[in-house]
Interface confidence: low
């Protein structure tokens, strides 16, 4: 009589994450008598996945009634399946003894899986940068499989060019992880944009992954000023104007000088937004000019976002405004609105 | 101002399906992600994913199981939300929310209220 | 799933307590976490973003710390006008994830 032959038709069976995967064996004789067993696999360390006489194993099912006596069938069925169930797995026959010993084993069945990529995190950078300077994001997706994989960077729909990606690890792994950093110029009108990181994967069935990130996370577009004198609103009180245009984020503080003296020190509140997301405010300032013998040198100074103040100043000619009589307080006022 | 204008109250039979409108003004419609959230009475709130207007680029919630269809209409300023195979347990109040000047769920429409009744 | 878990989950208190909500977050969410309000049969409310940022309007008795996964949402001394549910949301990973929310009522 012929000699009993294990029989693993498939090399390799590929299922997708979440999904079983039956693993075919076969064998061609009832003779000898004994167990079948599967081990993940092969050596000292292989590892028991589903054993015929005892033990429990809730993931794995029998696909045809093993227990039968004229049964050679011994395919099994692995659920929920994860990216740690790759390897390959060896459907072994036992001669039954005390102890069982191992007679023969099939080839082998090769069992990998795909896995779907998580979805791209885009991280920018800790800081605040203004346009013109060149920042870096990062882009990370892991837990995928295969190891091929596409990933392209965007700026509004623009593709990126100027970025390095690394897939890890190098060698053989149940999953990998993909890490990727751009390299984009900021410029003024990025309040809007976004950058986004694009993973394709033979999983995805040609829907990519998109992760993203809002440079308005990531720029500061600091404010022109302009100072100007608005015509007299009433004898001896000139109007004073500090235009503070094109400044991103809202967070800003003004501070009025008169011959760098503080006047007054307020906050940006009802601001305009323009179409580019950056915003506009308008601080003004009422100078009694009867209240000063000589000429004001008065400066707005803005402080934006924490950083170090800018100023822009603006001289008011007292001379060219006549004095009221008997007047020795300074009448100032300020304010702001909505431009 | 921003502004973020929903729908009036529906009320669907079980299998039915809902389309939800939100109309924005006030800001660059194509400029930023429209989410929608749910809240079942009495519960908390439910993120059902995301469309981008620019490139109507769109984000889902796993767990609604392609039930969920998010679209925009350029045009008129308009985001649509459409739940499909609904069932008695959809009965919630649906809400538009914007991402603005880089703050997520900044402002949010009034809500449109859904019931699923047979 | 990134899971966001508030507590507590109802709260009592006065007028002029101090009262904190914490929200945990299963994993590390940097500071992509907001704050919201919300009063019955209405939208939620931003209440604060980025961990600590409160927008205009927002009065200062409200504040946020934290990083990581661990974030706290402080008023400093409560108001009639305070008494609603509050909701954390992380932004960190798809999908987004709201904690169950806190219901602080009058005591």
């Known amino acids: 009589e012929e000699e009993l032959q294990v029989i693993q038709p498939d090399k390799s069976v590929s299922v997708a994450a979440g999904e079983s995967a039956i693993l075919h064996c076969t064998v061609t004789s009832l003779i000898p008598v004994g167990p079948i067993q599967w081990f993940r696999g092969a050596g000292p360390a292989r590892e028991l996945i589903y054993n015929q006489k005892e033990g429990h194993f809730p993931r794995v099912t029998t696909v045809s009634e093993s227990t039968k006596r004229e049964n050679m069938d011994f395919s099994i069925s692995i659920s929920n399946i994860t990216p740690a169930d790759a390897g390959t797995y060896y459907c072994v026959k036992f001669r039954k003894g005390s102890p069982d010993t191992e007679f023969k084993s099939g080839a082998g069945t090769e069992l990998s899986v795909r896995a779907k990529p998580s979805a791209p995190v885009v991280s920018g950078p800790a800081a605040r940068a203004t346009p013109q300077h060149t920042v870096s994001f990062t882009c990370e997706s892991h837990g995928f499989s295969p190891r091929d994989i596409t990933l392209k960077w965007f700026k509004n729909g623009n593709e990126l060019s100027d970025f390095q990606t690394n897939v890890d690890p190098v060698g053989e792994s149940v999953s990998y992880s993909i890490h990727s950093t751009a390299k984009v110029v900021l410029t003024r009108e990025d309040v809007h944009s976004q950058v986004i990181c694009e993973v394709a994967h033979v999983t995805l069935q040609g829907d990519p992954l998109r992760g993203t990130a809002n440079l308005s996370e990531t720029i500061r577009v600091p404010p022109t000023l302009e100072v100007t004198q608005q015509p007299v609103r009433a004898e001896n009180q000139v109007n004073v104007t500090c235009q503070v245009r094109k400044f991103y984020p809202q967070r800003l503080q003004l501070t009025w000088l008169e011959n760098g003296n503080v006047s007054r020190t307020e906050t940006a509140s009802t601001v305009t937004e323009n179409k580019d997301g950056t915003y506009n405010w308008m601080s003004w300032l009422l100078v009694n000019v009867s209240a000063h013998r000589d000429d004001v040198k008065l400066t707005c100074q803005v402080e934006h976002d924490g950083q170090p103040a800018v100023s822009k100043s603006h001289d008011l000619k007292v001379s060219a405004h006549p004095k009221e009589q008997g007047s020795n307080t300074a009448a100032e006022n300020t304010g702001s609105n909505e431009r | 101002q921003v502004q973020l204008v929903q729908s009036g109250a529906e009320v669907k039979k079980p299998g039915s399906s809902v389309k939800v409108s939100c109309k924005a003004s006030?800001?660059?419609?194509?400029?930023?992600?429209i989410h929608w959230v749910r809240q079942a009475p009495g519960q908390g709130l439910e993120w059902m994913g995301w469309?981008?207007?620019?490139?109507?680029?769109?984000n889902y919630n796993q767990k609604f199981n392609g039930r969920v269809t998010l679209t925009a209409d350029k045009s008129t300023s308009t985001a649509y939300m459409e739940l499909s195979s609904l069932r008695s347990e959809d009965t919630a109040v649906y809400y538009c929310?914007?991402?603005?000047?880089?703050?997520?769920?900044?402002?949010w429409g009034q809500g449109t209220l859904v019931t699923v009744s047979s | 799933d990134i899971q966001m878990t508030q507590s507590p989950s109802s709260l009592s208190a006065s007028v002029g307590d101090r009262v904190t909500i914490t929200c945990q977050a299963s994993q590390d969410i940097g500071n992509k976490l907001i704050w919201y309000q919300q009063k019955p049969g209405k939208a939620p409310k931003l209440l604060i973003y980025?961990?600590?940022n409160l927008p205009g309007g927002v009065p200062s008795r409200f504040s946020g710390s934290g990083s990581g996964t661990d974030f706290t949402l402080t008023i400093s001394s409560l108001q009639p006008e305070d008494f609603a549910t509050y909701y954390c949301?992380?932004?960190?990973?798809?999908?987004?994830?709201f904690g169950q929310g806190t219901k602080l009522e009058i005591k």
């Open positions: 980025y961990v600590t």
């Open positions: 929310a914007i991402n603005y000047g880089g703050i997520w769920f900044a402002y």
């Open positions: 469309i981008y207007p620019g490139d109507a680029d769109t």
């Open positions: 949301l992380q932004y960190k990973q798809n999908p987004l994830t």
């Open positions: 006030g800001y660059t419609f194509t400029s930023n992600y």
